[in-house]
């Protein structure tokens, strides 16, 4: 045996963004001749492991969220660990609102800003575009929860959603915003780039949207502290239909 065995990959099926109450399976994919697998949950103060190549979570709860990694053993030798998988619970807080300024119908060459707003003093926002395979380039400056898209092209057409969360609980996200359809109007827009149907949020768990942008806001407001215990975050806590006053 020369050098460590190559690392496996760890996948979440159907997605690593899991609405509370939904099922998810983590699967460690190594070579066919791997003898045994170890799956670890990497949580400071509580790093734990299970000797399986998969972990089935029938009902997603907040204590399932976090970072996971896996390794395999072959002829008594261990592989390098997989890249860490971030399993995110969504729907922990009520959904933010997503809007486009000046409009969601925008001519090519103009600028548009997508604005994600939460009723909580959250300091993190994530914007997803359905169907993208790579993260969008980050802008040079952040404007609170604004995602500026400079010089719109037809490729920017599509369906967007955003989530909000606190950096103190990075794996507990809000429900997704209602979808925002951005239509790039004008001669360079083709029918295939304009969505004909807005997918239902209920199918969130069955798609793998790629992260487009993440935004850490700078604000003079004191961010709300969210402490997470095995029982859950406090405050605020709840499914998307529960509402709380904005923290100070």
């Amino acid at each position: 045996q020369h050098g460590p065995l190559p690392k496996p990959s760890l996948q979440a099926q159907p997605s690593s963004l899991v609405p509370l109450g939904h099922p998810v399976t983590l699967r460690c994919l190594g070579p066919s001749d791997a003898d045994l697998y170890r799956l670890e949950k990497v949580k400071p103060g509580k790093l734990i492991f299970i000797d399986q190549d998969f972990l089935f979570i029938p009902i997603m709860e907040i204590n399932n969220a976090g970072r996971y990694r896996c390794s395999y053993q072959n002829e008594s030798h261990w592989s390098l660990p997989s890249d860490q998988l971030e399993l995110i619970a969504t729907g922990v807080y009520s959904k933010p609102s997503l809007s486009a300024h000046p409009s969601s119908a925008i001519p090519p060459g103009r600028d548009v800003t997508l604005k994600c707003q939460s009723q909580y003093s959250f300091d993190e926002f994530v914007l997803y575009k359905e169907g993208d395979t790579r993260p969008y380039k980050r802008p040079e400056k952040w404007y609170r929860a604004n995602f500026p898209v400079i010089t719109v092209t037809a490729a920017h057409s599509g369906t967007y959603r955003c989530y909000s969360f606190s950096s103190s609980s990075p794996y507990l996200w809000s429900a997704p915003s209602d979808p925002l359809v951005v239509v790039v109007t004008g001669p360079s827009a083709t029918p295939s780039q304009v969505p004909t149907e807005v997918p239902s949020p209920m199918t969130e768990a069955s798609r793998r949207p790629s992260m487009l942008l993440t935004n850490k806001i700078s604000t003079t407001e004191k961010p709300m502290n969210i402490t997470v215990s095995p029982e859950g975050p406090s405050p605020p806590f709840g499914f998307a239909h529960q509402h709380y006053a904005k923290g100070n």
Epitope: R38, G45, K46, I48, F49, I50, D51, Q73
Partner: antibody, heavy 123, light 112 residues
Framework: QVQLVESGGGLVKPGGSLRLSCAAS????????MSWIRQAPGKGLEWVSS????????DYAASVKGRFTISRDNAKNSLYLQMNSLRAEDTAVYYC????????????????WGQGTLVTVSS | QSVLTQPPSVSGAPGQRVTISCTGS?????????VHWYQQLPGTAPKLLIY???NRPSGVPDRFSGSKSGTSASLAITGLQAEDEADYYC???????????FGGGTKLTVLG
């Protein structure tokens, strides 16, 4: 209450063999990872070997690999360490230790230890 | 030589505060693995003192506390008492070969 009782230690010549046993009681033995940890006279603790709850996952310290074999019998609530090709540097008190477990997850620490059994390798 | 590095000895007078350091590497403590501490009183088996970096099992006085940062950890004992005189060991796990690793141990002497 949780009890771990080691036995089988004694005096053995270099190159000889010895089999240590650990009798467990007071908990569901088959649910827990188990380990052997040793301590040479006047020295620190050294992890020797671990075995998974079902006996499939087995790991050894490099210093004993190929010479020692860990095993368990869940029906008898017992952990074993077969030690072959013993050397003077294997002289130590050998402790049997239980790993903490919660629900289906195992932890990387030892929450209960036996009192140990002394193995002396000398000609 | 132990994978985790501890000072061989520390000492303090009754009532004082002492700390014991434990230094690892990027493949153990720095790889996210927790640090656990054991107390071994003279002539007895080790006993779990701190688990998961900073948690105390029931029955362990709150004079004992643990912390972890980066690739190192420390154990603090406040209000030192004569019965705290013992050997203290840190323990973690190493990702390279999935082996359990200990520090070399620190002998605590309570003066006077």
């Amino acid at each position: 209450q949780v009890q771990l009782v080691e036995s089988g230690g004694g005096l053995v010549k270099p190159g000889g063999s010895l089999r240590l046993s650990c009798a467990a009681s007071g908990f569901s033995f088959s649910d827990h990872y188990m380990s052997w940890i040793r301590q040479a006279p006047g020295k620190g603790l050294e992890w020797v070997s671990s075995v998974g709850s079902e006996g499939k996952f087995i790991d050894y310290a490099a210093s004993v690999k190929g010479r020692f074999t860990i095993s368990r019998d869940n029906a008898k609530n017992s952990l074993y360490l077969q030690m072959n090709s013993l050397r003077a540097e294997d002289t130590a008190v050998y402790y049997c230790a239980r790993h903490y477990r919660e629900f289906r997850w195992h932890y990387y620490y030892f929450d209960y230890w036996g009192q140990g059994t002394l193995v002396t390798v000398s000609s | 030589q132990s994978v985790l590095t501890q000072p061989p000895s520390v000492s303090g007078a009754p009532g004082q505060r002492v700390t014991i350091s434990c230094t690892g590497s990027s493949s153990n403590i720095g790889a996210g693995y927790d640090v656990h501490w054991y107390q071994q009183l003279p002539g007895t088996a080790p006993k779990l003192l701190i688990y998961g970096n900073s948690n105390r099992p029931s029955g362990v006085p709150d004079r004992f506390s643990g912390s972890k940062s980066g690739t190192s950890a420390s154990l603090a004992i406040t209000g030192l008492q004569a019965e705290d005189e013992a050997d203290y060991y840190c323990q973690s796990h190493d990702l390279g070969a999935h082996v359990w690793v200990f520090g070399g141990g620190t002998k605590l002497t309570v003066l006077g």
